[in-house]
Amino acid sequence: WPPPGTGDVVVQAPTQVPGFLGDSVTLPCYLQVPNMEVTHVSQLTWARHGESGSMAVFHQTQGPSYSESKRLEFVAARLGAELRNASLRMFGLRVEDEGNYTCLFVTFPQGSRSVDIWLRVLAKPQNTAEVQKVQLTGEPVPMARCVSTGGRPPAQITWHSDLGGMPNTSQVPGFLSGTVTVTSLWILVPSSQVDGKNVTCKVEHESFEKPQLLTVNLTVYYPPEVSISGYDNNWYLGQNEATLTCDARSNPEPTGYNWSTTMGPLPPFAVAQGAQLLIRPVDKPINTTLICNVTNALGARQAELTVQVKEGPPSEHSGISRN
């Protein structure tokens, strides 16, 4: 039996090693021998759990032998040298390479010493985010889409927004066997207030140093929302000319502005200039309801404003007058 004190010889290796699909990876494995200890190594062996036989052996006189010679290579072991480094390189990683491997040293006088290493096969996903252009529907619809393609394991997708919203995430197999494509939809009831706002898709994956953030600028198509500004309920005869503005928010942009009154065409004192209406000075009181009708690709909407020009001293008030 081995003499006392020989139990200190240990195999050092990480418990888990990550490798990328299609790339090569080194499974590190070393025999740690304390200063006062003596050991002699005659064979290095790698075996995979659940499989019969060993996948790689380095023999003191026969050298290296491999179950798949094109895919495996002892990194440091050499004939005629001390066998203390059993590190094994694997080329062209496949999904099925993921699993538990045993690295073993055949030593004298200690006997066999081994350690298990979990090989994790990763695939780095490609991430994209895009807006889902929507119209006002009155019910929740996908407004943004985030896709993480070909990840192993599947990427984690989360959404960050001040607008609320709910994610709807699904998975399908990726193009390469063992990979997964994750699609996440961000769902919200569309409104004009949401148009142009940003939401952020956050993609997390083992292969990333830090999460990837993808910003989506939301698009909601809606007909014009119209109001008229420029009137302060304080217009008097004899005051300067004034301007009313037809304020319209819409997506897409307005294609036309049309001014009129409830009685029909504009009176002579009102001159349309696109989104603006010039009100010229008048010499008698008026009480007219003006209409601004705005059109875009989705339809037309209008706003009404009743304007009164009252009698009163022009010097004390703003309003409508001849200069």
Epitope: P3, T45, T61, G111, S112
Partner: antibody
């Protein structure tokens, strides 16, 4: 070529000791552990123990309860096995074998007969 | 100690036959198993190491397989010169132990 040449046959009385030599050539003696295996006539193989020539580390099969001593002479690249308190059941062919985890080269064997 | 149980203990086969010898370990020995051929009046000769790897110079009709506790030595096409006794051996832990042997005769 690697060669392990053992000393000749021995006839011993019960209670006596025997020392067998194994002279090596064709490789660096200090780079390989030397082990000893015995085989009673018509029977299986039994591992006795091993020694590494460099620092003289040894490992013994407990079945031999301190009756076996393994030594080396690095100057002549020779390994020795001494077995004491011989009894009739120790009658066997004794082999030295170079260790590579398994045993890749063996001596020709030394017949030790223990008989009164 | 780890017991290595070999079967059969003896067998006869004709030239050209496929011959299989099995060895069962009493506990897991991984792939730390060797196979030896011993012809009458000669020392054992190493055939296979690490359960399945052939020593250089060993004809490729000899192959080994297995891991854990069950191991097999196969001679794919028996030749007259294969008349011998075959032993398995574990080197997973001390004391190293051998199977009791399989005597192979040619019909």
């Amino acid at each position: 070529e690697v060669q392990l040449v053992q000393s000749g046959s021995e006839l011993k009385k019960p209670g006596a000791s025997v020392k067998i030599s194994c002279k090596t050539s064709g490789y660096t003696f200090t780079e390989y552990t030397m082990h000893w295996v015995r085989q009673p006539h018509g029977k299986g193989l039994e591992w006795i123990g091993g020694i590494h020539p460099n620092q003289g580390e040894t490992s013994y099969n407990q079945r031999f309860k301190g009756r076996v001593t393994l030594t080396v002479d690095k100057s002549t690249s020779t390994a020795y096995m001494e077995l004491s308190s011989l009894r009739s059941e120790d009658t066997a062919v004794y082999y030295c074998a170079r260790w590579t985890g398994d045993f890749d080269y063996w001596g020709q064997g030394t017949l030790v007969t223990v008989s009164s | 100690d780890i017991q290595m149980t070999q079967s059969p203990s003896a067998m006869s086969a004709s030239v050209g036959d496929r011959v299989t010898i099995t060895c069962k370990a009493s506990q897991n020995v991984g792939t730390n198993v060797a196979w030896y051929q011993q012809k009458p009046g000669q020392p054992p000769k190493a055939l296979i190491y690490s359960a399945s790897y052939r020593y250089s110079g060993v004809p490729d009709r000899f192959s080994g397989s297995g891991s854990g506790t069950d191991f097999t030595l196969t001679i794919s096409s028996l030749q007259a010169e294969d008349l011998a006794e075959y032993f398995c051996q574990q080197y997973e832990s001390y004391p190293y132990t051998f199977g009791q042997g399989t005597k192979l005769e040619i019909k």
